[in-house]
Interface confidence: low
């Protein structure tokens, strides 16, 4: 005799009893009415299962909750199924067996026929697990049923000191969807919240779970697929306050079927977004957007933010949204990079874009901007990176495209190519009134507009000039004079310690900022406009440093231990972290501080010049870093502002030193032999380069490095030209405050060193 191997299969679900009605007592598990009714309903469920062929497998069951409307019973039951039948008894099959029994004319005296008028249509059976039952049982001491009426905002209070875990079973009218709002109120929190697209905590119906506070998402709203949701709130150790406000409402289903016709222009024309954006999209989301282009000269570009699409095998579900575009199946995924999906138009001038949630697990709502691009020249003067759909500078010595193709096939890399014989000359020699090419082609077209390219400067009227770095050089190169606008910057106030550095003189670096908390210098920064200071995002990594209210910014400061008449201080009214900043890779390590009042410029306080995106800082050039950081690795911060000259390093050289962890948003400076470098406390401070005009331009921000001043390891700086678009966007009020997906922070202090 061989014992048959069985497996415990757990099913969860609900049924409606048409001849019973919900009462408030039934909503409280501790009431006598609940205990009595749940025992009867459990017996009825047991009889129902037993009267089908599932009866022989029956193990146990429970009715754990009741809901509004005709009385809704929420239950689970366990069947011990022979191993070989495990796959044949899916929730759909089990439901069918139970519905058939409910509809049959059998003359049974069982309570599901005599006492309870069970609605077969309303029977819901879902797959569950033993673990789901364990989680459910752990919350039964604090189980709260709430019916959410339309128009009502229902606050949900956290577990009290006696209970560690609570479950809300939320239900609303059948034609509406449940929406939960979670708002962080504290920077320090250890509580967990999990939201399920079901009446109970079924792992397979998890919508999202949240642990720890997210500064990137101070408020999150989460949609269920329909009128039922379960929310489990588990209290963390030593958590004496609710770290967030939780509330819920019932909302109408929002349609996302759109037909649009685009105009024949190349700028952004609008956006598509999931219902209730920026709410998490619902597990039942199905959007269909049909876009028509004016002619086949154009392709359609979809611009995503912190979200990208990629091919996925057909047998794999998309876990963060499925996209169908021109019969191509793509999966969305969260990323801390920009991304564009380019849709070429070949035979038809229309395209349908479908977005579907394939699983219950969802994520922040998706917003995609759309524009047209010229199919014959998608990236005028630049390189189309087919990996991410972006236009990137070509042959500038920086691999912007993840596969590096923008730097392949270059005749002249980061140099000017003579038309006569393809020889290469360094960029500063172009339009310098000194012919270097064989026939002087480097000095031609210097007074007129040229096609835009990697190193051409774009004027405000969108025309381009050939002369490299024409900004603020005292000569008007643009027809509209825009290269000489906003030039109240970059001049040292008076004539003219960092590792290997020397002491600075007063007014020598009038843009230098000291960012302090409670009188202690934490990071450097640079003044870039009358209310704005730029610094490194990693200065704000620690949760205890995340609030702008904590910071004081000093300008015109020389010594840390004393004040002098030339220095001024400011509070910070707003803090903007780059939305793509990633602490582990140090990518996009830039932040902007808005000061509480405007700066009055003086000899000791004035801004540095910001470079254009096309500004070329030549490898080998000597530039300067300044700060109050440590003067040796592991040493204390300096009292007096230090300065040191460093050499800009070619990207490939630096990339090799750091085993290819150097992104296009990074720039390296220092020396192979080390000695001169930034160090702890210099983070966020300026790396500035002097142009021939005498003006100083911000090339980088102190970001990270291996140790300080070590041989073969350069200092790594945020490359300002690669984040300048975001800087301008924030300065002109275009937001950019750092959405960037659900992105939790655990950080390690200033000037990372490994």
């Amino acid at each position: 005799y061989k014992a048959e191997v069985t497996v415990s299969q757990v099913y969860s679900g609900s049924l409606r009893v048409l001849n019973r009605h919900f009462s408030q007592d039934l909503g409280r598990r501790e009431s006598i009415a609940f205990r009595s009714e749940s025992a009867k309903a459990q017996k009825m469920l047991q009889e129902l299962v037993a009267s089908t062929r599932l009866g022989t497998y029956y193990n146990s069951s429970s009715v754990y909750s009741f809901g509004e409307g005709p009385l809704t019973c929420f239950f689970w039951f366990i069947l011990d199924i022979p191993e070989y039948q495990r796959l044949t008894l899916s929730p759909e099959v089990v439901r069918e067996l139970l519905v058939d029994e409910l509809l049959s004319n059998s003359s049974t005296l069982a309570s599901y026929k005599t006492e309870y008028e069970v609605d077969p249509e309303g029977l819901v059976i879902l797959e569950a697990s033993v673990n789901d039952i364990v989680v459910l049982n752990s919350t039964l001491g604090c189980y709260r049923y709430s019916y959410v009426n339309p128009g009502q905002v229902l606050p949900l209070k956290g577990p009290d000191q006696q209970t560690t875990s609570c479950l809300w079973h939320l239900q609303g009218p059948e034609d509406l969807m449940i929406k939960v709002r979670l708002e962080w109120t504290r920077v320090d929190c250890r509580d967990r919240v999990a939201m399920y697209d079901a009446a109970g905590p079924l792992e397979k119906r998890l919508i999202t779970s949240v642990y720890g506070c997210s500064r990137q998402e101070p408020v999150m709203e989460v949609l269920a697929s329909g009128s039922v949701m379960a929310v489990v709130w588990k209290k963390g150790m030593h958590s004496y306050y609710d770290p967030f406000l939780l509330s819920v409402k019932s909302v109408a289903f929002q349609d996302c079927q759109v037909n649009l016709t685009l105009e024949g222009r190349l700028d952004t024309q609008g956006f598509l977004r999931t219902p209730y954006y920026p709410s998490y999209y619902s597990p039942s989301t199905h959007c269909s957007w049909h876009l028509t282009v004016p002619s086949l000269d154009y392709g359609l570009a979809l611009w995503f933010d912190a979200y990208a699409l990629r091919r996925q095998k057909y047998n794999r579900l998309c876990t963060q949204g499925q996209w169908m575009i021109q019969n191509r199946r793509l999966c969305g995924f969260r990323t801390l990079q920009p991304y564009a999906e380019r849709i070429p138009m070949v035979a038809s001038d229309g395209v349908t874009i479908n977005f579907t949630s394939q699983i219950s697990l969802t994520g922040p709502g998706v917003q995609v901007y759309y524009s047209l691009y010229n199919q014959s020249d998608p990236c005028p003067g630049e390189f189309l990176c087919s990996v991410n759909g972006l236009c990137v500078p070509a042959c500038d010595g920086i691999k912007d495209c993840p596969n590096g193709l923008d730097e392949r096939n270059c005749v002249c890399r980061a140099m000017f190519q003579c038309q006569e014989d393809s020889t290469c000359i360094s960029l500063p020699r172009v339009c310098d009134r000194q012919p270097d090419c064989l026939n002087g082609s480097d000095e031609e077209q210097c007074q007129e507009g040229v096609p835009c390219g990697t190193f051409t400067f774009q004027c405000e009227d969108r025309s381009c000039v050939k002369k490299p770095n024409p900004e603020c050089d005292g000569q008007s190169d643009c027809r509209d004079g825009s290269d000489e606008q906003h030039c109240d910057c970059g001049l040292q106030g008076l004539s003219s310690r960092i590792v290997g550095g020397t002491v600075s003189s007063e007014g020598e670096w009038p843009w230098q900022a000291s960012l302090q908390i409670r009188g202690r210098h934490i990071c450097g920064g640079a003044l870039i406009a009358d209310r704005w200071v730029i610094t490194a995002a990693h200065c704000f990594q620690e949760d205890s440093m995340a609030s702008p209210k904590l910071w004081t910014v000093f300008l015109g400061k020389m010594r840390q231990n004393s004040r002098w008449p030339g220095e001024v201080s400011f509070k910070v009214s707003r803090l903007f972290l780059h939305p793509y900043h990633e602490e582990d890779s140090h990518d996009y390590d830039v932040a902007l501080l808005q000061l509480d009042h405007p700066v009055v410029y003086s000899a000791t306080v004035r801004p540095v010049c910001l470079p254009a995106r096309s500004h070329f800082f030549e490898p080998g050039q000597h530039c300067w870093i300044t700060g109050w950081g440590a003067q040796r690795e592991g040493g204390p911060v300096s009292n007096t502002l230090q300065k040191v000259d460093v050499q800009l390093v070619p990207q490939d050289l630096c990339s090799e030193a750091y085993r290819y962890q150097v992104s296009p948003r990074m720039l390296c400076a220092g020396y192979r032999k080390g000695k001169k470098d930034a160090c702890q406390g210099d983070s966020g401070g300026p790396l500035v380069c002097r142009e021939p005009s005498g003006r100083w331009f911000l090339a980088g921000l102190v970001s990270w490095g291996l140790g300080c001043g070590r041989p073969n390891f350069f200092g790594v700086y945020t490359r300002v030209t690669r984040v300048i678009n975001w800087i301008q966007q924030v300065l002109t009020g275009g937001g950019g405050s750092g959405g960037g997906g659900s992105h939790h922070h655990h950080h390690h202090g200033s000037h990372h060193h490994h």
């Epitope: 691999k399 590096g404 193709l405 392949r408 290819y660």
Partner: antibody, heavy 124, light 111 residues
Framework: EVQLVESGGGLVQPGRSLRLSCAAS????????IYWVRQVPGKGLEWVST????????AYADSVKGRFTISRDNAKNALYLQMNSLRTEDTALYYC?????????????????WGQGTTVTVSS | QSALTQPPSASGSPGQSVTLSCTGT?????????VSWYLQHPGKAPKLMIY???KRPSGVPDRFSGSKSANTASLTVSGLQAEDEADYYC??????????FGGGTKVTVLG
């Protein structure tokens, strides 16, 4: 199993043409740069041609430039080498090889999967 | 593009180390850190042993190590074993999407 299988080799007279094929399986073909490399019996390896995953970057060795054409059909997971104006010095075993997966910013220019090769003999 | 220079042969006894050299120019081996090494047994396809000068693909024993100095790359096989007897080829990226191979070194395991 990751595999590359070459075919189309044979005996051909100088000046004539031949088309080699390489069938890929077991990996996402259109994620990879692919190479043709040849080897004269008893001699060393010689790089012949490279094609990027979307065919927008193609390169040839000086010895075959203007005579050979590399192409790929990602829908069919296939790589081709059209060889025209064949010369006796083109006699060799022709391999197709896949470039090793690149890390985030760099290609490796290293071939981690090779076929078994197909023999081309150019003789009158 | 001219081939990289490799010595035609090298040998060593089991357990010993053998170092193979691969000399190029300042525009291939000297400029790029994209040197690879391949092993080829008679009648078989080449097998990648080292890429990016010194990185080993998974499955390659740590007896194989690579390095580079100026225009010369080296492959060291330590603790020589009978199955290491084979032809070894180096290759380097040479710019403009071109790859250049060495002429190969025949390694003999003595005894």
């Amino acid at each position: 199993e990751v595999q590359l299988v070459e075919s189309g080799g044979g005996l051909v007279q100088p000046g004539r043409s031949l088309r080699l094929s390489c069938a890929a399986s077991g990996f996402t073909f259109n994620d990879h740069v692919i190479y043709w490399v040849r080897q004269v019996p008893g001699k060393g390896l010689e790089w012949v041609s490279t094609i990027s995953w979307n065919s927008d970057t193609i390169a040839y060795a000086d010895s075959v430039k203007g005579r050979f054409t590399i192409s790929r059909d990602n829908a069919k997971n296939a790589l081709y080498l059209q060889m025209n104006s064949l010369r006796t010095e083109d006699t060799a075993l022709y391999y197709c090889a896949r470039e090793k997966d690149g890390d985030f910013y760099y290609d490796y220019f290293a071939m981690d999967v090779w076929g078994q090769g197909t023999t081309v003999t150019v003789s009158s | 593009q001219s081939a990289l220079t490799q010595p035609p042969s090298a040998s060593g006894s089991p357990g010993q180390s053998v170092t193979l050299s691969c000399t190029g120019t300042s525009s291939d081996v000297g400029y790029y850190n994209y040197v690879s090494w391949y092993l080829q047994h008679p009648g078989k396809a080449p097998k990648l042993m080292i890429y990016e000068v010194s990185k080993r693909p998974s499955g390659v024993p740590d007896r194989f190590s690579g390095s580079k100095s100026a225009n010369t790359a080296s492959l060291t096989v330590s603790g020589l074993q009978a199955e290491d007897e084979a032809d070894y080829y180096c290759s380097s990226y040479a710019g403009s999407n071109k790859v250049v191979f060495g002429g190969g070194t025949k390694v003999t395991v003595l005894g």
